[in-house]
């Protein structure tokens, strides 16, 4: 007996799709060998239709695919737009068609059920609304209009124009008779139930002159859309429930083992704590549609999700829903990066953000997740250089190390910086990731003066002390601007050779400005890095004065409150999804720090590289 297993018989109807799962023992050889779906011919040969190596036969082009799930020992063959010609005997297997491991599958595609002539078919999901159209002749215009449901050989009255309503349809059905001249009446049924499924008969008038029209109502439980996403990546559930529920509370829930549905998030402010920091419910469009984004996907996020509408913000029978089955692929293309980064008060963090390496030209963003109401994510910085005003001098987004990773540096940390941040781009939305910044006890490793006032035309020397553990790191000074941090020449004054006794006090790197000009005023960062991987940074503000003043004065721009017109990652997620960003920075106007002219030698050059660095604290 072959160890490959699958469905022995698959039956469907024309125009439908099938999803055939085949199971195999997940040995390392089996996991990586070729998978195929072939059709057995009269000669006994089995002709490949689709394989895991990318082959798709001409009559399957555009309607079939094969997906391997090596970690599970399964592969899935999806075939759409079935026709009667697809009926036949097939094999799903591993290796070579003629020999190797396989399983026989019989596929039968039929025409679908026979219906009375002229029957109109209405296919609607449970909870939605259907409008059944019933034509009639002029002579029946003044006569009784009615809708019956056929149950076996009998017809049960559902509604009529004399105000009768069958109790099973109470409060969710209406019969509309148009004005004169229109020879059609309609029956509207809201909040469809599975039990509404069946054959209906419209009738106008009575006796031999009556008008009749058959309607076949197919009420479907929404078929879960299969969604496959990578571990650590992001998923977006787009939920369009129709105008009828545009003003009703919306929710996303996850079906549990008891068959109830636990609310993940809703528009009434409820959110499952397991999704803290990594979920947003985007405000609805006028048509009532909305979307939910979940980042930092975990294996335990797998399951069946339903979105729906109900005034209670949770699942209720007979209300519209949409369904997804989420699978999280552990063999992820998204690299591992720390989900928690720790820094000390006054110190810094350097966060590595993954992006799709095929999209090196995409715009990069970093936003702060806020949990209030449905969640939002105001953008703090972007690769075009715009930085939220209150982050001036302490936040920068760098293209390094490149090749699928960018870096965000935040310094002058306070306890208020603790929270969840999202890395994202205007490209592949599945690469959105979440990082939590935690502020822990400790001292910054890099020490710079707190107040620096430079005198115009004179020489200024700013020291930056670093501990012995950074002796092998590259040290640098840079001048911060809202487009980056331009590296400046600096002098490492500590011994550069390997040493036995590390004198903490002698380890310093200095920045010299000679002569000081007006353009030198601003924020300067002292930092350490290894190649293109950034470590800690410390920031110092340099004020420039006309003449020498007794004592020193520290000039610091006051930290601004959050701009009321800040840009926010909310409904804009949709625009990113649709790649239809006119303003790719995600909606609403935004106050930005104006570029302050000459930035000491132009903007920082970025260099592409790869690999990874620990993410941790830094200095002020």
């Amino acid at each position: 007996k072959s160890p490959v297993f699958g469905p022995q018989e698959v039956s469907s109807v024309e125009g439908n799709s099938v999803s055939i799962k085949c199971y195999y023992p997940p040995t390392s050889v089996n996991r990586h060998t070729r998978k195929y779906w072939c059709r057995k011919g009269a000669s006994g040969r089995c002709i490949t239709l689709v394989s895991s190596e990318g082959y798709v036969s001409s009559n399957y082009a555009g309607r079939a695919n094969l997906t391997n799930f090596p970690e599970n020992g399964t592969f899935v063959v999806n075939i759409a737009q079935l026709s009667r010609d697809d009926s036949g005997h097939y094999k799903c297997g591993l290796g070579i068609n003629s020999r190797g491991l396989s399983f026989d599958v019989s596929l039968e595609v039929s025409q679908g059920p026979e219906l009375p002539n002229g029957t109109e078919v209405y296919t609607v999901d449970v909870g939605r609304t259907v409008t059944i159209k019933c034509p009639f002749k002029t002579e029946n215009a003044p006569k009784t209009k009615a809708l019956y449901k056929k149950i076996g050989q009998t017809s049960v009255l559902v509604i009529d124009s004399r105000n009768y309503v069958n109790p099973n349809y109470k409060d969710r059905i209406r019969l509309r008779i148009p004005g004169t001249g229109q020879l059609i009446f309609t029956v509207v049924i809201d909040r469809l139930r599975l039990s509404d499924h069946g054959l209906y008969l419209c009738q106008a008038g009575d006796g031999s002159n009556r008008d009749e029209k058959n309607a076949d109502l197919q009420v479907l439980e929404p078929e879960p859309e299969l969604v496959y996403e990578d571990l650590r990546g992001s998923v977006t559930f787009h939920c369009a429930l129709g105008l009828e529920v545009a003003n009703v509370a919306k929710f996303l829930c996850r079906v549990n083992s008891r068959e109830t549905c636990d609310v993940v998030i809703n528009t009434l402010g409820k959110r499952d704590s397991a999704f803290e920091g990594r979920i947003l419910l985007n405000p609805q469009d006028k048509d009532g549609s909305f979307s939910v984004v979940i980042t930092g996907l975990r294996k335990e996020d797998e399951g069946r999700y339903l979105c729906g509408a109900h005034s209670d913000g949770q699942l209720q029978e007979g209300w519209p829903i949409q369904a997804w089955q989420l699978f999280v692929n552990e063999e992820s293309t998204i690299p591992r990066s720390p989900t928690v980064v720790k820094g000390v008060a006054g110190g810094s963090v350097a966060v590595l953000c993954p992006y799709n390496p095929k999209e090196s030209q995409s715009l990069k963003y970093w936003c702060l997740w806020e949990g209030a109401q449905n969640g939002r994510c105001p953008l703090l910085v972007e690769s075009q250089g715009l930085v939220q005003e209150q982050y001036e001098g302490r936040l920068s987004l760098l293209q390094e190390p490149g090749n699928g990773t960018f870096t965000v540096i935040l310094n002058q940390l306070t306890t208020q910086d603790a929270g969840f941040y999202w890395c994202l781009t205007n490209g592949d939305t599945r690469w959105r990731t979440t990082v939590e910044i935690k502020i822990i006890e400790g001292e910054p490793n890099l020490k710079v003066p707190g107040n620096v006032t430079a005198v115009l035309g004179e020489t200024l020397n700013i020291p930056c002390h670093f501990p012995c553990k950074f002796s092998s790191y590259e040290k640098y000074w840079c001048k911060w601007s809202n487009t980056g941090c331009q590296t400046l020449p600096s002098q490492d004054e500590g011994p550069s050779e390997a040493f036995v006794n590390c004198d903490e006090n002698s380890r310093l790197v200095s920045l010299t400005l000679n002569p000081v000009t007006r353009a030198d005023e601003g924020w300067y960062w002292c930092g350490v890095k290894q190649g293109h991987f950034y470590g800690e940074t410390a920031a110092v503000y340099v004020a420039v004065e006309e003449k020498k003043v007794a004592g020193s004065r520290y000039v610091s721009p006051a930290k601004a409150d959050a701009a009321p017109d800040e840009k926010v990652l909310d409904s804009g997620v949709r625009e990113i999804e649709n790649k239809a960003i006119q303003d790719p920075r995600l909606f609403a106007e935004e106050k930005v720090v104006a570029d302050t002219g000459d930035q000491a030698g132009g903007s920082r050059a970025s260099v592409d590289s790869s690999s990874s660095e620990e993410q941790g604290g830094s200095s002020k």
């Epitope: 698959v10 068959e259 069946r304 699978f327």
Partner: nanobody, 130 residues
């Protein structure tokens, strides 16, 4: 809560036929898959057959030991599943359990694995006499 009730078990002679039924009921229960397992005294629970559906599409799975002899089907409403047992053998003697699943779960879930089914009936005894 979901209830599964099996019926149709009993005594049958070798080579004979029997038809088991399993009815699902409970709050808004419309299963996604239903199946049959069996357990002979002192043995592990064994997969017999399963049927899974999605709209107008149906998938039928049959265990190796009953292939060609047993067939699985369901009623139009999808709440009752049948196991048609033909050409029965003494080794088919066992308690037959109905199983059901409301949710299409992870791609790795194998219908042959009892752990992957959410709901179970109490069982019906089938005895095949020689």
């Amino acid at each position: 809560q979901v209830q599964l009730v099996e019926s149709g078990g009993g005594l049958v002679q070798t080579g004979g036929s029997l038809r088991l039924s399993c009815a699902a009921s409970g709050r808004t229960f419309s299963p996604y898959a239903m199946g049959w397992f069996r357990q002979a005294p002192g043995k592990e629970r064994e997969f017999v057959a399963a049927i899974r559906w999605s709209g107008a599409t149906t998938y039928k799975y049959v265990g190796d030991s009953v292939q060609g002899r047993f067939t699985i089907s369901r009623d139009a409403a999808g709440n009752t599943v049948y196991l048609q047992m033909n050409s029965v053998k003494p080794e088919d003697t066992a308690v037959y359990y109905c199983a059901a699943d409301r949710v299409p779960k992870d791609i790795s879930i194998d219908p042959r694995n009892p752990k992957d089914w959410d709901y179970w009936g109490k069982g019906t005894l089938v005895t095949v006499s020689s």
